[in-house]
């Protein structure tokens, strides 16, 4: 079972090479535990780039390694990517998965394209 | 009282472009996705697309895809339509809908008419 | 694309009649994501039925829906003076989201 996923159609990274976007889903059912996944897409190939289960009105997880952080408001899910470099620009794509109670829904957005520009270095100064 | 009240429409020119609002009362208009809805004279019911409830989504059905665009403001509780390049088959009454599946609200409509 | 077929398209009927609409998808649809419409002219499209079979609040009990995977009917137990009108099914997922083509249903 599917479900509505909403998402920004172009992010800037800033010049610490950090994205943030809203991931919005509508709920189909009253969820209590739900999973977040960024996808990341480029030349036709998709990779995880992190993940997230939470329990509604708590704190998103993600790995102590993760790229990711996040908060989650009602419905919403705002999504900060950290670390990122001009090889990084793709079109990342939120995957929203209400887990439990049952059913199971699962919905994906179009993607967000995030680019981001590597900062000029700083010219040596006398 | 949840209200939703379109405004905007009226007659233009082919090739032309309008902008509808919806204008949304008596409910916290940023919790809710809003759909746009038309009707043909005469014909059923069209789905044109919707907005999420920041505004950071929207969605369109293939044919208005590139020609529409769906935004909002939620500090105005406000909801636009913005609808280019205007032919005669895009006379109709427009209506804003609220829910994300089902629309549990419409406003009253808004009659465009398309002609020279 | 999802197309919804209603059958009849138009149906003629007397007050206190049973009615029943039927609502045909071309591929299965979730009953979390079917839904019906009632309009009358000049007016605006008013939700009677969500999740294939739960009314709307305010909908009369006279009003009922059921079905699953790629049919649906509306049915109106015994028919009203202001039941007489235009009814619409609609699915929300996946989009685009798409209406029946309308059922007319006028006095005998």
């Known amino acids: 079972k599917a479900m509505h996923v909403a998402q920004p159609a172009v992010v800037l990274a800033n010049s610490r090479g950090t994205a943030s976007f809203v991931c919005e889903y509508a709920s189909p059912g009253k969820a209590t535990e739900v999973r977040v996944t960024v996808l990341r897409q480029a030349d036709s190939q998709v990779t995880e780039v992190c993940a997230a289960t939470y329990m509604m009105g708590n704190e998103l997880t993600f790995l102590d390694d993760s790229i990711c952080t996040g908060t989650s408001s009602g419905n919403q899910v705002n999504l900060t990517i950290q670390g990122l470099r001009a090889m990084d620009t793709g079109l990342y794509i939120c995957k929203v998965e209400l887990m439990y109670p049952p059913p199971y829904y699962m919905g994906i957005g179009n993607g967000t394209q995030i680019y981001v520009i590597d900062p000029e270095p700083c010219p040596d100064s006398d | 009282e949840v209200q939703l009240v379109e405004s905007g429409g009226g007659l233009v020119q082919p090739g032309g472009s309008l902008r509808l609002s919806c204008a949304a009362s008596?409910?916290?208009?940023?919790?809710?996705?809003i759909h746009w809805v038309r009707q043909a004279p005469g014909k059923g019911l069209e789905w044109i697309g919707w907005i999420s409830p920041s505004g950071g989504g929207t969605k369109y059905a293939q044919k208005f895809q590139g020609r529409v665009t769906i935004s909002r403001d939620n500090s105005k509780n406000t909801l636009y339509l913005q609808l280019n390049s205007l032919r005669a088959e895009d006379t109709a009454v427009y209506y804003c809908a609220r829910g994300a599946y089902e629309f549990d609200y419409w406003g009253q409509g808004t009659l465009v008419t398309v002609s020279s | 694309d999802i197309q919804l077929t209603q059958s009849p398209s138009s149906l003629s009927a007397s007050v206190g009649d049973r009615v029943t609409i039927t609502c045909r998808a071309s591929?299965?649809?979730?009953?979390?994501?079917l839904a019906w419409y009632q309009q009358k002219p000049g007016k605006a499209p008013k939700l009677l039925i969500y999740?294939?079979?739960n009314r709307a609040t305010g909908i009369p009990s006279r009003f009922s829906g059921s079905g699953s995977g790629t049919d649906f009917t509306l049915t109106i137990s015994s028919l009203q003076p202001e039941d007489f009108a235009t009814y619409y099914c609609q699915q929300s997922y996946p989009t685009p989201l798409t209406f029946g083509q309308g059922t007319k249903v006028e006095i005998k």
């Open positions: 999740d294939a079979s």
């Open positions: 591929q299965s649809v979730s009953s979390r994501f």
């Open positions: 008596g409910f916290t208009f940023s919790d809710y996705w």
